[in-house]
Interface confidence: medium
């Protein structure tokens, strides 16, 4: 070829047009070109349709071409690798229809400030996504839902302040996650799921070490050998395993995995960290066993309601919904009680999957679940285990997505300790046994009567309690279209000694209703 260098590599015909001061695709390239290098040219704009005659094209390098616009038209049915790195792209084109076979997409070192909803839709074969060195502040919900085969994800060196809770849902093949050098201050509970992640880069973020960080701390402790730091010197580029590279920004660079968590809410006297553990299912690695926690799993679907779009987040732990040292009959000191941010639930209730029965039915003894003890050094309290449901998937975002839940800034007046008001003259129905049951101690599960007489808007993150009524009544008041309470769909199984008398296993005390 008069302009480009042509060579054969195995069954591939490689055409090298690098550094030729090209402003457009050179004419008359071999029709059976499979690898095309157009790096370091002055293309400014480029249309993928110009490559349609090259039906065997599997790899296209357009890096360092001063690209400000990539026109996405036509189809390149077998293109597997697209390198758009080191350009000037301000938005990511929707590539799914044009590049259905794409396995590697590199858009590192561009000027992306956000990604559109459905940015990766149609890229079901994608295995590697490189977005390092852009200006991303947030990620859209469900970004990676269309890419279940993803193995490597780089979001390093952006301006990310938070991550969507379900970002990694369904990514069973993910082995490399690069999040270093962002503005991340916390990791959402349950973010990593339960599958092994051999390579994680998390250093260079301003991690805020408070009670919200305890899930992340526990994950770091359990995955210390998989946390790496990327070191780049004059002559050496290397990665080394170093969990201490993940450091508290507010505590003199103290390693997050050693953060003591003093003063964080606890469940009785049984240790302050198990309250924050979240592993969705029992996970055995070698001889290390992780115990299943008290986890409620909700189908992750967006529900349109009269009050707007609800997102029922994929997982929530009952453990984290139980405030510490809260006696079931403690008197309210204020007419309105506000739960402080650290107890703010991170999910909305999926009404179709919960039950409230007006007339208590007699139930058989629940089948005890086997108790698995937490690995030392932190013993787990004896907890109720709900029957796990299949792992949910992140929803495809709708045209009107719900805002990502954020933890509110504390107000100038500190929120009072949560208290439960005295029962009114119309108490909640007692359990099915004829004799009155004793009030359980806080070591088991407390009876928490929380009224929700007015539904809180999705933007609000504080749960406000007013005059107490039974949970059932408040549910009926707040959901007008429910003439009858929904029927119980799940069976609660537990291994508490007093499971029959445990109010948390009673239908009318099934779940705290945070909205």
């Amino acid at each position: 070829h008069p302009i480009c260098e042509v060579s054969k590599v195995a069954s591939h015909l490689e055409v090298n047009c690098d550094k030729r001061n090209l402003t457009a695709l050179p004419p008359d390239l071999p029709k059976d070109t499979t690898i095309l290098h157009l790096s370091e040219n002055l293309l400014y704009t480029f249309s993928l349709a110009t490559l349609m005659p090259y039906t065997r094209l599997t790899q296209l390098n357009l890096d360092r071409c001063e690209l400000t616009k990539l026109q996405v038209d036509g189809t390149l049915p077998v293109l597997g690798t697209l390198d758009l790195s080191h350009n000037q792209l301000q938005s990511l084109p929707l590539l799914g229809q044009t590049l259905p076979a794409l396995t590697v997409l590199d858009v590192s070192f561009n000027r992306l400030t956000s990604l559109p909803l459905g940015a990766l839709r149609g890229l079901g074969e994608l295995q590697e996504l490189y977005l390092k060195g852009n200006e991303l502040k947030t990620l859209p919900p469900g970004l990676l839902t269309p890419t279940p085969k993803l193995e490597k994800l780089s979001l390093a060196n952006n301006n990310l302040t938070e991550l969507p809770a379900g970002l990694l849902n369904g990514l069973e093949n993910l082995d490399t996650l690069l999040l270093q050098e962002n503005s991340l201050y916390t990791i959402p509970k349950g973010f990593f799921g339960s599958h092994l992640l051999p390579f994680a880069f998390l250093h260079g973020n301003p991690w805020l070490c408070n009670c919200e960080i305890l899930y992340f701390r526990r994950w770091l402790q359990d995955n210390a050998e998989n946390v790496y730091v990327w070191k780049q010197g004059v002559d050496v580029k290397a990665m080394t395993s170093n969990v201490a590279s993940v450091q508290c920004d507010n505590s003199d660079k103290f390693p997050v995995y050693k953060y003591p968590g003093k003063g964080c809410p606890t469940l009785g006297d049984e240790g302050d960290t198990d309250l924050y553990d979240y592993y969705p299912e029992e996970d055995t690695e070698g001889d290390k066993v992780r115990a299943t926690r008290t986890v409620v799993k909700f189908p992750t679907k967006a529900h349109t309601t009269p009050w707007g779009l609800f997102y029922s987040w994929s997982t929530a732990s009952l453990d984290s919904q139980m405030p510490s040292s809260l006696h079931p009959t403690q008197e309210s000191t204020k007419e309105q009680t506000t739960f402080p941010p650290r107890w703010t639930p991170n999910f909305t209730l999926h009404m179709e999957s919960i039950t409230f029965s007006k007339t208590p039915k007699s139930t058989t003894e629940p089948t005890p679940s086997p108790t698995t003890s937490e690995p030392v050094p932190e013993p787990a309290p004896n907890m109720t285990t709900l029957e796990p449901t299949p792992s949910p998937t992140t929803p495809e975002p709708t045209s009107e997505p719900a805002p990502s839940p954020t933890t509110p800034e504390p107000t100038s007046e500190p929120a009072p300790s949560p208290t439960t008001p005295e029962p009114t003259s119309e108490p909640a129905p007692s359990p099915t046994t004829p004799e009155p049951t004793p009030i359980p101690t806080i070591a088991t599960s407390p009876t928490i009567l929380v009224s929700a007489t007015s539904l809180i808007t999705p933007k609000s993150t504080f749960l406000t309690t007013t005059k107490p009524v039974s949970l059932l009544e408040s549910t009926k008041k707040t959901i007008p279209e429910l003439d009858q309470p929904p029927k119980l769909r799940g069976v609660l199984q537990g291994h508490l000694e007093s499971s029959r008398n445990d109010p948390f296993l009673h239908p009318d005390f099934c779940c705290l209703l945070p909205l």
Partner: nanobody, 125 residues
Framework: EVQLVESGGGLVQAGGSLRLSCAAA????????MGWYRQAPGKQRELVAI??????????DSVKGRFTISRDNAKNTKNTVYLQMNSLKPEDTAVYYC????????????????WGQGTQVTVSS
């Protein structure tokens, strides 16, 4: 700089076998193609065998049926390539070089190509 570490060379009698291996550091997470080239004294460097990320392979005519190239598929050792050399002949004597192409790393780096230092294979008659 992508470093490739080769091993397995040595002295062997004609008709014998050797297995060469070449590993790139784990920090280079994605390598499009890995292969082996050789250079005999006073001759040009020539392709012996190459394997692409999709498993496609190619061999020099002179080694077809005797040499086999393979690539480790385990997650943490994906960047390792092997050359099994059977029925070795004196004319296979050369310095064997590992080559990697289309390399992406955890630092966001991209390298078009990298070479190992070479390992000596000597076949005596």
């Amino acid at each position: 700089e992508v470093q490739l570490v080769e091993s397995g060379g040595g002295l062997v009698q004609a008709g014998g076998s050797l297995r060469l291996s070449c590993a790139a550091a784990a920090s280079w997470f994605s390598i499009y193609a890995m292969g082996w080239y050789r250079q005999a004294p006073g001759k040009q460097r020539e392709l012996v065998a190459i394997i692409l990320s999709d498993g496609d392979t190619d061999y020099a005519d002179s080694v077809k049926g005797r040499f086999t190239i393979s690539r480790d598929n385990a997650k943490n050792t994906k960047n390792t390539v092997y050359l099994q050399m059977n029925s070795l002949k004196p004319e296979d004597t050369a310095v064997y070089y590992c080559n990697a192409r289309g390399i992406r790393g955890s630092g966001g780096d991209y390298a078009r190509e990298a070479w190992g230092q070479g390992t000596q294979v000597t076949v005596s008659s």
